[in-house]
Amino acid sequence: SGVFQLQLQEFINERGVLASGRPCEPGCRTFFRVCLKHFQAVVSPGPCTFGTVSTPVLGTNSFAVRDDSSGGGRNPLQLPFNFTWPGTFSLIIEAWHAPGDDLRPEALPPDALISKIAIQGSLAVGQNWLLDEQTSTLTRLRYSYRVICSDNYYGDNCSRLCKKRNDHFGHYVCQPDGNLSCLPGWTGEYCQQPICLSGCHEQNGYCSKPAECLCRPGWQGRLCNECIPHNGCRHGTCSTPWQCTCDEGWGGLFCDQDLNYCTHHSPCKNGATCSNSGQRSYTCTCRPGYTGVDCELELSECDSNPCRNGGSCKDQEDGYHCLCPPGYYGLHCEHSTLSCADSPCFNGGSCRERNQGANYACECPPNFTGSNCEKKVDRCTSNPCANGGQCLNRGPSRMCRCRPGFTGTYCELHVSDCARNPCAHGGTCHDLENGLMCTCPAGFSGRRCEVRTSIDACASSPCFNRATCYTDLSTDTFVCNCPYGFVGSRCEFPVGLPPSFPW
């Protein structure tokens, strides 16, 4: 679809005569008829296959035709066509004299023709005007012409329809050849697909407008390349959505069970070695000079009372030193220069000669000790309390304060974690060194058998005679749907054959 445009510029008829040579009275009131048709080697009369157009009276005898495209579109003259421009044409321009106001062909005398020109040739679609001038014996016509495409038609022959658009069926403008030119941010044959944010994951992300990255279910992140782990996953990751793969040192469905308390909490102090011993459980092996569950207590080397025979102990940076009482010597004041004659035994201790009187030994009464019975017995010295219990002196006796989970005089008994019946739904409880474990009955799971998991009561194929089995999830029992001809809770009896009861 396009338009053949003809711009009349100047007509010269100096003598004001008709084609017959007869003069116009009072002058030649000139109008034009234009015929556009298919290419003919010799332009001949006949139908104007591409269209016709007539002008009003434009002037008398000789005149210039002004551009009147704004005021009604009379010049240039428009000859629209609704077909593919063939690239060739024939054009006939006739100048007529109008004696009156009626310009219809039938209203004019045949000799009112002033001049007639006919041209033919090739013409490509384009914006440029072709200027031409045709001269006859008495007249001269100057004009220009061109072919342009109608709105929304493009290409060499105006055959390509293209309408710019900016909606979800396309975001484009039209190129001169009628091809689409996508607006920034759009792609695809019809420019309807947005170009997502650079790096947006091809499968897991998408977009509805340019530079966007919307994530499909199970994915997250600016580029939708991070999977979303299982809801509640604490110390775990995923490689596909809804997974919960535990980080090292964590366990359980949600990776919330600490299997590496040592690394995550560093409970052992003063350079002690930590050993994991179960979920949230650990043991500290203390370096020399330290004690306590977490090796948090500094041991004085004098605490073990290494000095004998009443020697006093002094802590030193690299150990300890014994200051011996008179009559004793040695690293621990273990050597005596005394004999029983010197009455070396205190607190009622009895003296016994040894090595022919060169040495002696004291036999101490109860509650006293030491090589000279000089020390009151500290009943806690021997660390009698097991499992980290704290020893307390109570006059002549002693007492152990136990850590949670232990009992007994010396904290030697492990309190049964199972005593509280922690396993739900009839689960069996097992005491472990550092906690407990529940063995759950069928249909239950979880650390305390608290989660009901449906058992497939139909798994054992309890129904006979090709009956359909259904599991009742509320009671974990089965129901048999009998085929025709069978009855009974398991469809075991044929209809008409009553069961043989034992009574």
Epitope: D151, L161, F169
Partner: antibody, heavy 121, light 106 residues
């Protein structure tokens, strides 16, 4: 040959939500060349475009219905769905699903047979 | 709000030409589609992209679109062409239908 089939309740009470599903057979809903639309026609009246959806989930709605309409797509089932909330008697119509072809510049070349939804208490 | 206006009815004799118009502001800058709908049936696309026919649509259906008016022309109208005809165009991201024209073959 592509076929579209609407399904859903034929009677909805006023103020409730109308829900319809369109099942596509004979072609993939995940093609980049198509949008999948809903159009309705009240008894004795013309067609009214409700909205459409792309396989990615991008939706476009008629501004006059936008506040009440939700269209969704399930590519795994080759289905797309319409939900219209707070219905009144004015929503009584034959509801059609249709395929809108990008290559046909948005022309709808395949339609479902339509399902009449009546809004009444 | 974009509106497409169609005459409610057009009558034509068998074998004659029926022209149905659809007008809307600058409709010529949009692509027009035409649908035929017979009573109790779903619409059928007869013209898309102003003047193109889908496969299976007879040649007697043609279309044009320029200025503010799109036109559907049925040449050599047959009794089987008696139906409602609806035009459609897209305004931004919204589908818009004309009110429909009832074509009666006398």
């Amino acid at each position: 040959e592509v076929q579209l089939q609407e399904s859903g309740p034929g009677l909805v009470k006023p103020s409730e939500t109308l829900s319809l599903t369109c099942t596509v057979s004979g072609g993939s809903i995940s093609s980049s060349s198509y949008y999948w639309g809903w159009i309705r026609q009240p008894p004795g009246k013309g067609l009214e475009w409700i909205g459409d959806i792309y396989y990615t989930g991008s939706t476009y709605y008629n501004p006059s219905l936008k506040s009440r309409v939700t269209i969704s797509v399930d590519t795994s089932k080759n289905q797309f769905s319409l939900k219209l909330s707070s219905v009144t008697a004015a929503d009584t119509a034959v509801y059609y699903c249709a395929r809108e072809d990008v290559i046909l510049r948005g022309g709808s070349d395949y339609w479902g047979q339509g399902t009449l939804v009546t809004v009444s208490s | 709000l974009y509106v497409l206006t169609q005459p409610p009815s057009v009558s034509v004799s068998p074998g004659q030409t029926a022209s149905i118009t659809c007008s809307g502001q600058r409709l010529g800058d949009k692509y027009a589609s035409w649908y035929q709908q017979k009573p109790g049936q779903s619409p059928v696309l007869v013209i898309y992209e102003d003047s193109k026919r889908p496969s299976g649509i007879p040649e007697r259906f043609s279309g044009s679109n320029s200025g503010d008016t799109a036109t559907l022309t049925i040449s050599g109208t047959q009794t089987m062409d008696e139906a409602d005809y609806l035009c459609q165009a897209w305004d931004r991201d919204t589908g818009v239908f004309g009110g429909g024209t009832k074509v009666t073959v006398l």
